[in-house]
């Protein structure tokens, strides 16, 4: 079947990294510079991908692989094979059209990127709030506050009347 | 092909002014968010302004506000960045950056940019 194939269509012989050249009675031509063919019998070859400004080389082009790209420090990669460059942000913060803003009182956010999330209920689960919540982390919920009666656990509960936040911005 | 391509920078003393512009081609510009970032010698890549498609909405990072203006010509295809009162902080390598689709909705990621011009503050 191959070869009965590349009888009837000479360009099914051209591997990768060349094209079909129908301007040379259908030979097969090496790949121009900056471009790829990553199959065989291609009668193009493809123009390689540029890596510059928000975007740097990860993997450069070959003839028969397209270049990689990923994002330059500051920007982090999103979407398939790296299609954009997001800024990142600082942990307490999360990103807007505005730029990078402080996570409001009440949310946290603990990576670079991503938005702020609000601090866990620790009441809905019948709990009480061991560790403050802040911008970057959140809250660490205890024993319920009935746990700890006394004798019943070493913990010390936090003060009732503090609201579990961090300082004013 | 889509392309953004920068001009305008140059060497210009603390104090003074420059114009950057960024000619797009391949595209239309009218149809998207469009970006100025930049990347100091020796640091990461930081975002410096923004402007929505009909320059209803700009927005710029703290340290540049009140001396950097973004604006664009949609008729023309391009961006600009008007900097005055320039310091020896904004010495930089600025990248004009094309906001991918979704942007400010879905996120905020940006999918062309120019190969950049560079600035350079010093007396």
């Known amino acids: 079947f191959e070869r009965t194939r590349s009888l009837q269509d000479p360009c099914s012989n051209c591997p990768a990294g060349t094209f079909c050249d129908n301007n040379r009675n259908q030979i097969c031509s090496p790949c121009p510079p900056n471009s790829f063919s990553s199959a065989g019998g291609q009668r193009t070859c493809d123009i390689c991908r540029q890596c510059k400004g928000v975007f740097r080389t990860r993997k450069e082009c070959s003839s028969t692989s397209n270049a990689e790209c990923d994002c330059t420090p500051g920007f982090h990669c999103l979407g398939a094979g790296c299609s954009m460059c997001e800024q990142d942000c600082k942990q307490g913060q999360e990103l807007t059209k505005k730029g990078c803003k402080d996570c409001c009182f009440g949310t946290f956010n603990d990576q670079k990127r991503g938005i702020c999330r609000p601090w866990t209920n620790c009441s809905l689960d019948g709990k009480s709030v061991l560790v403050n919540g802040t911008k970057e982390r959140d809250v660490v919920c205890g024993p319920s506050p009935a746990d700890l009666s006394p004798g019943a656990s070493s913990v010390t509960p936090p003060a009732p009347a503090r609201e579990p936040g961090h300082s004013p911005q | 092909e889509v392309q953004l391509v920068e001009s305008g920078g140059g060497l210009v003393q603390p104090g003074g002014s420059l114009r950057l512009s960024c000619a797009a081609s391949?595209?239309?510009?009218?149809n998207y968010w469009m970006n100025w970032v930049r990347q100091a010698p020796g640091k990461g890549l930081e975002w410096?302004?923004?402007?929505?498609?009909?320059?209803?909405?700009?927005y710029y990072v703290d340290s540049v506000k009140g001396r950097f203006t973004i604006s664009r010509d949609n008729a023309k295809n391009s961006l600009y960045l008007q900097m005055n009162s320039l310091r020896a902080e904004d010495t930089a390598v600025y990248y004009c950056?094309?906001?991918?689709?979704?942007?400010?909705?879905?996120?905020?990621?940006?999918?062309?940019s120019g190969q950049g011009t560079t600035v350079t503050v010093s007396s």
């Open positions: 950056a094309r906001g991918g689709e979704g942007y400010g909705v879905d996120h905020y990621g940006l999918d062309v």
């Open positions: 391949g595209f239309t510009l009218s």
């Open positions: 410096v302004a923004n402007i929505n498609q009909d320059e209803s909405e700009r």
